[in-house]
């Protein structure tokens, strides 16, 4: 058993049929010595008396808010949560496996630039009685500071019969140099509590590996005289690291109709303009990627050909 | 600790081309190592990230773009003195700071060159003959060093009398390649910045 926060404790249980469970001793936070009784949750049934209560925690029915009273007055609470371990593996029931970029990916993180700011998000089908708390650091043995905000519900989607909820959090490394060469990864730890179930999820990454620029901005077309070719120009996104001559991007320019199966014109360039062939009912799209370290491409910025 | 804006004339920067070749060569070599050594811990997640130039050179700090010198987190640099002549300095107006930066890059390359050559000598003794260093990568390191044209003492190639542990050598190769790729990215960014300035 360990303390998650004040008056909230996590009991780690090997979860299998007829498991013996864990013996837990609760102590009432009071100078009083006698006349103390214990109850669980909203029940008025007295579970025991005395300053300490010893319980055998085997299942979710044994978890919850234990309260010690004296003469009708509440003295203190202890909330017990369960953390299940099945076949040596901690449960991951609360969050959905996003399976990208690999299986068992519960947390996904992205950074728009090298400033040390990044966003992580996760998915769940659970809508109520759900709380998250996020901690982060650079390295684990001698951790350097990363400050994370509160996790918030950022999107709701319908997936078949189920609703899916996306939560996200923004974090900022306390003293980040955009030009630094990372040797210690960022660690992100998410504590998830659903009702009386506790789970924790972690992710470890270098900022350089989670870079995904914003799409290029200010796309403009200029038809070339006596030609079917069009000059398309754009600018670096405002959120990208500066100076741009140091933090350079490379671009992919594509002309395609509405369907992905349609034929297309595609060209890669390090410049902020390119010449492509425009077709009726097609769109010109441009996306960006770090020129020197190939992490993710940005989303597409698009303009219609006509 | 920073690069000034007044640097060589546009298009007069012979090192840019060589640095692009360097990044390409080390990326290809790393990809080859990952494929060939698929049953070894050779991915970014699996290896320890070591920097053989740590406390010996200060490339990131010495080559910091002027715009980032206002960022206090970028300024915890180690002061190191370097030789200040080089043929990539295509303008006489080039400052002492830029010479410091380019000479730091030269020292990086020299250190990695020695490590890679020592390692290759060991890998050539491996009866499995599983992986060797790409001669192209070694040549590209040499070309960039020549373009930088700094005079410095030759670092002797390390020779070892004991029987090499090939498993450890291959893991060390992965660690070195990952670190060198990261440094090659920095070098490419620096050369691009200098070329544009």
């Amino acid at each position: 058993i360990w303390e998650l926060k004040k008056d909230v404790y996590v009991v780690e249980l090997d979860w299998y049929p007829d498991a013996p469970g864990e013996m837990v001793v609760l102590t009432c936070d009071t100078p009083e010595e006698d006349g103390i009784t214990w109850t669980l949750d909203q029940s008025s049934e007295v579970l025991g008396s005395g300053k300490t209560l010893t319980i055998q925690v085997k299942e979710f029915g044994d978890a919850g808010q234990y309260t010690c009273h004296k003469g009708g007055e509440v003295l203190s609470h202890s909330l017990l949560l369960l953390h299940k371990k099945e076949d040596g593996i901690w449960s991951t029931d609360i969050l959905k496996d996003q399976k990208e970029p690999k299986n068992k990916t519960f947390l996904r993180c992205e950074a728009k630039n090298y400033s040390g700011r990044f966003t992580c998000w996760w998915l769940t089908t659970i809508s109520t009685d759900l709380t998250f708390s996020v901690k982060s650091s650079r390295g684990s043995s001698d951790p350097q500071g990363v400050t994370c905000g509160a996790a918030t519900l950022s999107a709701e989607r319908v997936r078949g019969d189920n609703k899916e909820y996306e939560y996200s959090v923004e974090c900022q490394e306390d003293s980040a140099c955009p030009a630094a060469e990372e040797s210690l990864p960022i660690e992100v730890m998410v504590d998830a509590v659903h009702k009386l179930k506790y789970e924790n999820y972690t992710s470890s990454f270098f900022i350089r590996d989670i870079i995904k620029p914003d799409p290029p901005k200010n796309l403009q077309l200029k038809p070339l005289k006596n030609s079917r070719q069009v000059e398309v120009s754009w600018e670096y996104p405002d959120t990208w690291s500066t100076p741009h001559s140091y933090f350079s991007l490379t671009f992919c320019v594509q002309v395609q109709g509405k369907s992905k199966r349609e034929k297309k014109d595609r060209v890669f360039t390090d410049k902020t303009s390119a010449t492509v062939i425009c077709r009726k009912n097609a769109s010109i799209s441009v996306r960006a990627q770090d020129r020197y370290y190939s992490s993710s491409w940005s989303e597409w910025a698009s303009v219609p050909c006509s | 600790r920073n690069l000034p804006v007044a640097t060589p004339d546009p298009g007069m920067f012979p090192c840019l081309h060589h640095s692009q070749n360097l990044l390409r060569a080390v990326s290809n070599m790393l990809q080859k190592a990952r494929q060939t050594l698929e049953f070894y811990p050779c991915t970014s997640e699996e290896i320890d990230h070591e920097d053989i130039t740590k406390d010996k050179t200060s490339t990131v700090e010495a080559c910091l773009p002027l715009e980032l010198t206002k960022n206090e987190s970028c300024l915890n640099s180690r002061e190191t003195s370097f030789i200040t002549n080089g043929s990539c300095l295509a303008s006489r107006k080039t400052s002492f700071m830029m010479a410091l930066c380019l000479s730091s890059i030269y020292e990086d390359l020299k250190m990695y060159q020695v490590e890679f050559k020592t390692m290759n000598a060991k890998l050539l003794m491996d009866p499995k003959r599983q992986i060797f260093l790409d001669q192209n990568m070694l040549a590209v390191i040499d070309e960039l060093m020549q373009a930088l044209n700094f005079n410095s003492e030759t670092v002797p190639q390390k020779s070892s009398l004991e029987e090499p542990d090939f498993y450890k050598t291959k893991i060390k190769l992965c660690i070195l390649l990952h670190a060198f790729r990261i440094r090659a990215v920095t070098i490419d960014r620096v050369m691009s910045y200098l070329n544009a300035s």
Epitope: R228, Q229, T250, R261, E262, K263, K264, D265, R266, V267, F268, T269, D270, T275, I277, R279, K280 | -
Partner: antibody, heavy 118, light 107 residues
Framework: QVQLVQSGAEVKKPGASVKVSCKAS????????LHWVRQAPGQGLEWMGW????????EYAPKFQGRVTMTTDTSTSTAYMELRSLRSDDTAVYYC???????????WGQGTMVTVSS | EIVMTQSPATLSVSPGERATLSCRAS??????LHWYQQKPGQAPRLLIY???QSISGIPARFFGSGSGTEFTLTISSLQSEDFAVYYC?????????FGGGTKVEIK
């Protein structure tokens, strides 16, 4: 699968014209760009131009501008390349090729040998 | 127009050995570079597109790399069926242009 079958070999006199055909099967002609590339005996490859069968748009290499015409007949799934004012150095194998991407060549025809000789 | 230069013109290699073919562009073409293989009496066949992207059905021993002005096609271990002429082609701008080819022959 996608296939391109070209017309047979031709022998032409200098100053004449030649029209090479290229019949597509295994796909809808309008779904792909169509290019023509030639190869003189023992020489390398030379791009001549492309046509978009969907709308008839064409782009020719400057070297062939004014001397080449590329057309398609969607009813027969056939593309044509006509080269006029033939010279002896136009002797080559002419290939048609198709791709969903405009700028490189995925599916090639078997080639048509055109000999220009007096 | 962009001029593509391939080297060497002829490469003599023993089966099982590694072959490295070079292609240089007269100006920067990013990764807009494609490789083809042509055997005598046959049409060319696409091997690699956009400098390093593999084509399904093409053996993994064919490996493309490079960007800007310098590109390489590496055949890690030459098989008898790999002896052929290899062409690079740029798609950065029209007119599309090919290199002069590298003939890979048996040593």
């Amino acid at each position: 699968q996608v296939q391109l079958v070209q017309s047979g070999a031709e022998v032409k006199k200098p100053g004449a014209s030649v029209k090479v055909s290229c019949k597509a099967s295994g796909y809808t002609l309008t779904d792909y760009y169509l290019h023509w590339v030639r190869q003189a005996p023992g020489q390398g490859l030379e791009w001549m131009g492309w046509i978009d069968p969907e709308n008839g748009d064409t782009e020719y290499a400057p070297k062939f501008q004014g001397r080449v015409t590329m057309t398609t007949d969607t009813s027969t799934s056939t593309a044509y390349m006509e080269l006029r004012s033939l010279r002896s150095d136009d002797t080559a194998v002419y290939y048609c090729n198709a791709n969903k991407e405009l700028r490189y060549f995925d599916v090639w025809g078997q080639g048509t040998m055109v000999t220009v000789s007096s | 127009e962009i001029v593509m230069t391939q080297s060497p013109a002829t490469l003599s290699v023993s089966p099982g050995e590694r072959a490295t073919l070079s292609c240089r562009a007269s100006q920067s073409i990013s990764i807009n570079l494609h490789w083809y293989q042509q055997k005598p009496g046959q049409a060319p066949r696409l091997l690699i597109y956009f400098a390093s992207q593999s084509i399904s059905g093409i053996p993994a021993r064919f490996f493309g790399s490079g960007s800007g002005t310098e590109f390489t096609l590496t055949i890690s271990s030459l098989q008898s069926e790999d002896f052929a002429v290899y062409y690079c082609q740029q798609s950065n701008s029209f007119p599309l242009t090919f290199g002069g080819g590298t003939k890979v022959e048996i040593k």
